[in-house]
């Protein structure tokens, strides 16, 4: 068998409500991924399992069931979302996103999928992280890839 | 570093018009709220608006309506405020301000102001 | 427009004294998302304000912990516990909750 190729392309949106008494946010993330099947047969994306975290603390999670199928050689992309919440113990999180005189109000996240894959009864996993950015502050719609976090460090949370 | 370089003093005649920048370094004015402030002599401080550069989106305080207008270039980095049938009571200071933050930092950031003197 | 109504207009102060400004809006300034965007600034002679106090009570980064902001709903206060000379200037209360934004009208801290 050949490879199944996933990347993680980045955040598609980040659509945004706030619980004002518990000062709390909510934060649906659509991500997107490009799954590629090298092989001369079809392949099952049988599940896949997603988690959210910021500074070390997982804020999401999701897990997609029985997705698509990919043919010989192809390729989809696939979208998913994540609903993370981001909780009164982070009220310093609530200042930050609520402050209405600055414009952009990005958060490092730390994105992880794993891609479950059968062909013929086998079953392969594979996983992907990645920090990205995202706005807390507004409803937003990225361009693919415009939410990278560059710095290769792991950002001092 | 920051900075915000307003343009220089103007010494205007009245009903006439001017236009007064804001450049902007050490930051992309298009991810950050541009905002006007005046200040008559030995007067207080007035909110004049804000503008959001990247969509040109503003808000204006009803008294300034009609004659403030307030305009971005983000090739050039700037923010513009056009004052239009001044008067003498527009003699003023006018400054450009914004604020920057992150998580764990915000910062004020104020131009040194820009003079307009309305005299015939 | 919110009114933002400062006294007093002046205020003769000894170093080292305590000095207590006031700031009173002309209705709540308690924002949708439930924050208080009330701000103080000073202002010295030929210089651009500086911000001093945000959301009320937050301290601005590099500003001495003898100021000290207080206050909900309409009623604000700045106080100065020991006023040093690099503290004379005039102080501007600001609200940043509904717009138009607007300043207080000014208090000048000046020695007696």
């Known amino acids: 068998p050949r490879s199944i190729d996933v990347k993680y392309i980045g955040v598609k949106s980040a659509y945004v409500s706030y619980d004002v008494q518990k000062r709390t946010i909510y934060l649906n993330i659509t991500n997107t991924l490009n799954i590629t099947n090298n092989n001369y047969y079809s392949v099952e994306v049988e599940n896949i399992t997603a988690q959210v975290q910021f500074a070390k603390t997982v804020i999401g999670k999701a897990r997609l069931n029985n997705i698509t199928h990919i043919g010989p050689l192809d390729m989809k992309q696939i979208d998913y979302t994540v609903p993370t919440v981001i909780a009164e113990e982070m009220s310093y999180m609530y200042d930050f996103c609520t402050l209405i005189s600055i414009k952009v109000h990005n958060i490092v996240l730390m994105m992880q999928v794993t891609v479950t894959t059968t062909y013929f009864g086998h079953s392969e996993q594979i996983s992907q992280e990645r920090y990205q950015y995202v706005d807390c502050g507004r409803n937003t719609t990225y361009q693919l890839g415009q939410s990278e976090y560059l710095n290769v460090l792991q950002p001092q949370q | 570093d920051v900075q915000l370089q307003q343009s220089g003093a103007e010494l205007v005649r009245p009903g006439a018009s001017v236009k007064l920048s804001c450049t902007a370094s050490g930051f992309n004015i298009k991810d950050y709220y541009m905002y006007w402030v005046k200040q008559r002599p030995e007067q207080g401080l007035e909110w004049i608006g804000r503008i959001d550069p990247e969509d040109g989106d503003t808000e204006n305080a009803p008294k300034f309506r009609g004659m403030a207008t307030m305009t971005a270039d983000t090739s050039s980095n700037t923010a513009y405020l056009q004052l239009n049938s001044l008067t003498s009571e527009d003699t003023a200071v006018y400054y450009c301000?914004?604020?920057?933050?992150?998580?764990?930092?915000?910062?004020?950031?104020w131009g040194h102001g820009t003079s307009v003197t309305v005299s015939s | 427009d919110v009114l933002m109504t400062q006294t007093p207009l002046s205020l003769p102060v000894s170093l080292g004294d305590q000095a207590s400004i006031s700031c009173r809006s002309s209705?709540?300034?308690?924002?949708?998302?439930?924050?208080?965007?009330l701000e103080w600034y000073l202002q010295k002679p030929g210089q651009a304000p500086k911000l001093l106090i945000d959301k009320v009570f937050n301290r601005f980064s590099g500003v001495p912990d003898r100021f000290s902001g207080s206050g909900s709903g309409t009623d604000f206060t700045l106080k100065i516990s020991r006023v040093e000379a690099e503290d004379l200037g005039v102080y501007y209360c600001?609200?940043?909750?509904?717009?138009?934004?607007?300043f207080g009208s000014g208090t000048k801290l000046e020695i007696k």
């Open positions: 209705q709540s300034i308690v924002h949708s998302n439930g924050n208080t965007y």
């Open positions: 301000t914004t604020r920057i933050g992150n998580l764990y930092h915000v910062m004020d950031y």
């Open positions: 600001f609200q940043g909750s509904h717009v138009p934004f607007t």
